[in-house]
């Protein structure tokens, strides 16, 4: 009986339904390729339920396998622009703790102006995800063109 | 004991597992950029479990955070075709109720013939999702090239 | 009481949380367009929880609706290379049992060097998924550039 009752009383977060969808806040200074994210209902349709933002980077609060997804669109971009400024590359990875640093997802824009992808990956409490955009083109800040999110899938 | 028993008796839909995967039915008349979708086992591998179709547009039946995904491929397309007829753009958004109208996901084809993306977004019961394809190229109706779906993720 | 207790004792797999994320092992011999996959913690961040590998192809162990996702990047590729070697196409499908053979997801590279997509599809125990890469370019074996996975979503 206790387990059934406990289930009724547990907040959603304790069921492992950690999820976040972020919108672009700003890019870093010149030598910092990281994108800085923001989230919360006041900003539109972005949110954090479980994970947190640490100086614009996403920090995981629950161990598990996550679906990580991202879309980045380059600002004022045409296929000509994109090819001229090649290579522009986006990489999503664990950037801290340093001992767990690894690239999880990498895409180049080539002659396109948008990249979008997703993957399943194990993440641990305390992992911070960074999204590095290398190249001389700026990402669009439109919330329907550039976004980044994670979804807890299973322990 | 009641909760455990109730769980055993509840249909899947009541657990919040709403999900749909749709295939292209047809495009709209010239001044209507919307794509019209269809779904159901008789049509192949498309289905609706929870959400419904309203005149070819997807209507949400349960509040929650959803993973929305889409792939659209242009018919008889090469990179030359795609670049010549730029801009061809796909946007997924809430089109009704009007008070909640917003673009959720937007991609341009540039020199490519396929776009594919996904995002997490809060949706409410009664929200209708529209997929607008602007441009003068037709979307492929092949079920492995063009599809649109949603998956309930959490309340 | 029994159901609640049973829930506590059931392994995750019995809850239907089947999930796999694979990395590229190798390509097939010349006349075989299939990509051969591998997975497991010893290899990095790939894993199989439920599904199994059968000679490098992914075999499903539980009926249900799955989210299938894939990213493939071509090795030593530029937009010039990609367009010159066009058409390079990736298709994900059920390849056995033969009675259920069908293409689920298809993308061409055109002038790009990466394709990434995802879709929801019903799969049955025993279905084997094959990923066919046609063309004369090799896929990258970098684990952040080429990967393939499935996630059980609902019965």
């Amino acid at each position: 009986q206790r387990f059934a009752q406990a289930q009724q009383q547990l907040p959603l977060e304790s069921l492992g339904w950690d999820v976040a969808e972020l919108q672009l806040n700003h890019t870093g200074p010149q030598q910092d390729p990281r994108l800085y994210w923001q989230g919360g209902p006041a900003l539109g349709r972005s949110f954090l339920h479980g994970p947190e933002l640490d100086k614009g980077q996403l920090r995981i609060h629950r161990d598990g396998i996550y679906m990580v997804h991202i879309q980045v669109t380059l600002a004022i971009c045409s296929s000509t622009t994109a090819s001229r400024h090649h290579p522009t590359t986006l990489a999503v990875g664990i950037c801290s703790p340093a001992s767990r640093s690894i690239s999880l997802l990498r895409l180049s824009f080539h002659q396109g102006c948008t990249i979008a992808s997703q993957r399943l990956t194990p993440l641990a409490r305390g992992d911070t995800l960074c999204t590095n955009l290398t190249g001389t083109l700026l990402p669009s800040r439109n919330t329907d063109e550039t976004f980044f999110g994670v979804q807890w899938v299973r322990p | 004991q009641r909760f455990a028993q109730a769980q055993q008796q509840l249909p899947l839909e009541s657990l919040g597992w709403d999900v749909a995967e749709l295939q292209l039915n047809h495009t709209g008349p010239q001044q209507d950029p919307r794509l019209y979708w269809q779904g159901g086992p008789a049509l192949g591998r498309s289905f609706l479990h929870g959400p419904e179709l309203d005149k070819g547009q997807l209507r949400i039946h349960r509040d929650g955070i959803y993973m929305v995904h889409i792939q659209v491929t242009l018919a008889i397309c090469s990179s030359t075709t795609a670049s010549r007829h730029h801009p061809t753009t796909l946007a997924v958004g809430i089109c009704s109720p009007a008070s909640r109208s917003i673009s959720l996901l937007r991609l341009s084809f540039h020199q490519g013939c396929t776009i594919a993306s996904q995002r997490l977004t809060p949706l409410a019961r009664g929200d209708t999702l529209c997929t607008n394809l602007t441009g003068t190229l037709l979307p492929s109706r092949n079920t492995d090239e063009t599809f649109f779906g949603v998956q309930w993720v959490r309340p | 009481q029994r159901f609640a207790q049973a829930q506590q004792q059931l392994p995750l797999e019995s809850l239907g949380w089947d999930v796999a994320e694979l990395q590229l092992n190798h390509t097939g011999p010349q006349q075989d367009p299939r990509l051969y996959w591998q997975g497991g913690p010893a290899l990095g961040r790939s894993f199989l929880h439920g599904p199994e590998l059968d000679k490098g192809q992914l075999r499903i162990h539980r009926d249900g609706i799955y989210m299938v996702h894939i990213q493939v990047t071509l090795a030593i590729c530029s937009s010039t290379t990609a367009s010159r070697h066009h058409p390079t196409t990736l298709a994900v499908g059920i390849c056995s049992p033969a009675s259920r053979s069908i293409s689920l997801l298809r993308l061409s590279f055109h002038q790009g060097c990466t394709i990434a997509s995802q879709r929801l599809t019903p799969l049955a125990r025993g279905d084997t998924l094959c990923t066919n890469l046609t063309g004369t370019l090799l896929p990258s074996r970098n684990t952040d550039e080429t990967f393939f996975g499935v996630q059980w979503v609902r019965p």
């Epitope: - | 018919a75 008889i76 010549r84 190229l137 492929s140 109706r141 092949n142 | -």
Partner: antibody
Framework: QVQLQQSGPEVVRPGVSVKISCKGS????????LHWVKQSHAKSLEWIGV????????DYNQKFKGKATMTVDKSSSTAYMELARLTSEDSAIYYC?????????????WGQGTLVTVSA | DIVLTQSPASLAISLGQRATISCRAS??????????LHWYQQKPGQPPKLLIY???NLESGVPARFSGSGSGTDFTLNIHPVEEEDAATFYC?????????FGGGTKLEIK
């Protein structure tokens, strides 16, 4: 409404060239490519080629390469086709045509045709 | 190039009856879930007029007595009931690839 107005009939001697025109009106000229089609008794309808009214890019039917040259003048919303080294085989009605809304080559809009007669 | 073969070359149909014209392609003109095959009507001294596009779609302003069907390599234009003003030559055309080609034409005469 969309209109394609072609130049008048031409009677020309063998071996010379002729340049015929097609002026578009009732729509944004640079929005849609223009196609040229030949109609003769011997060969029914034959597609000659297409020219982008936006940037002048062309695609020719292999059979008409060296015979036809398509050009465009955006300022006057006019497309031209020059036929070189004329022979009796080139005697035909030449139509310009335009696609409809979708960018695939079927033709709801046609010019009235230009009759070219090659005669000594 | 894709060759389109029309049959018959000519036919005479009584007023109110059904006219059926066939168009066969040397290879499939279907792709991406569409059939890129179109039908035109041409009367003497006039340019061709589009009747049907993508095998079965009626062009705006064309009477509903015209209908098209088929996929792959075999296509049909039906006119029912035939009216006096339908006397003309009918052409099929594909746009599956460059160059687009036309059928040889079918001349419809009203008896």
């Amino acid at each position: 409404q969309v209109q394609l107005q072609q130049s008048g009939p031409e009677v020309v001697r063998p071996g010379v060239s002729v340049k015929i025109s097609c002026k578009g009106s009732g729509y944004t000229f640079t929005d849609s490519a223009l196609h040229w089609v030949k109609q003769s008794h011997a060969k029914s309808l034959e597609w000659i080629g297409v020219i982008s009214t936006y940037d002048g890019d062309t695609d020719y039917n292999q059979k008409f390469k060296g015979k036809a040259t398509m050009t465009v003048d955006k300022s006057s919303s006019t497309a031209y086709m020059e036929l070189a080294r004329l022979t009796s085989e080139d005697s035909a009605i030449y139509y310009c045509a335009r696609r409809g809304y979708y960018d695939y080559d079927w033709f709801p809009y046609w010019g009235q045709g230009t009759l070219v007669t090659v005669s000594a | 190039d894709i060759v389109l073969t029309q049959s018959p070359a000519s036919l005479a149909i009584s007023l109110g009856q059904r006219a059926t014209i066939s168009c066969r392609a040397s290879k499939s003109v279907s792709a991406s879930g569409y059939s890129f095959l179109h039908w035109y009507q041409q009367k003497p001294g006039q340019p061709p007029k589009l009747l049907i596009y993508l095998a079965s779609n009626l062009e705006s302003g064309v009477p509903a007595r015209f209908s098209g069907s088929g996929s792959g390599t075999d296509f049909t234009l039906n006119i029912h009931p035939v009216e006096e003003e339908d006397a003309a030559t009918f052409y099929c055309q594909h746009s599956r690839e460059l160059p687009p080609t036309f059928g040889g034409g079918t001349k419809l005469e009203i008896k």
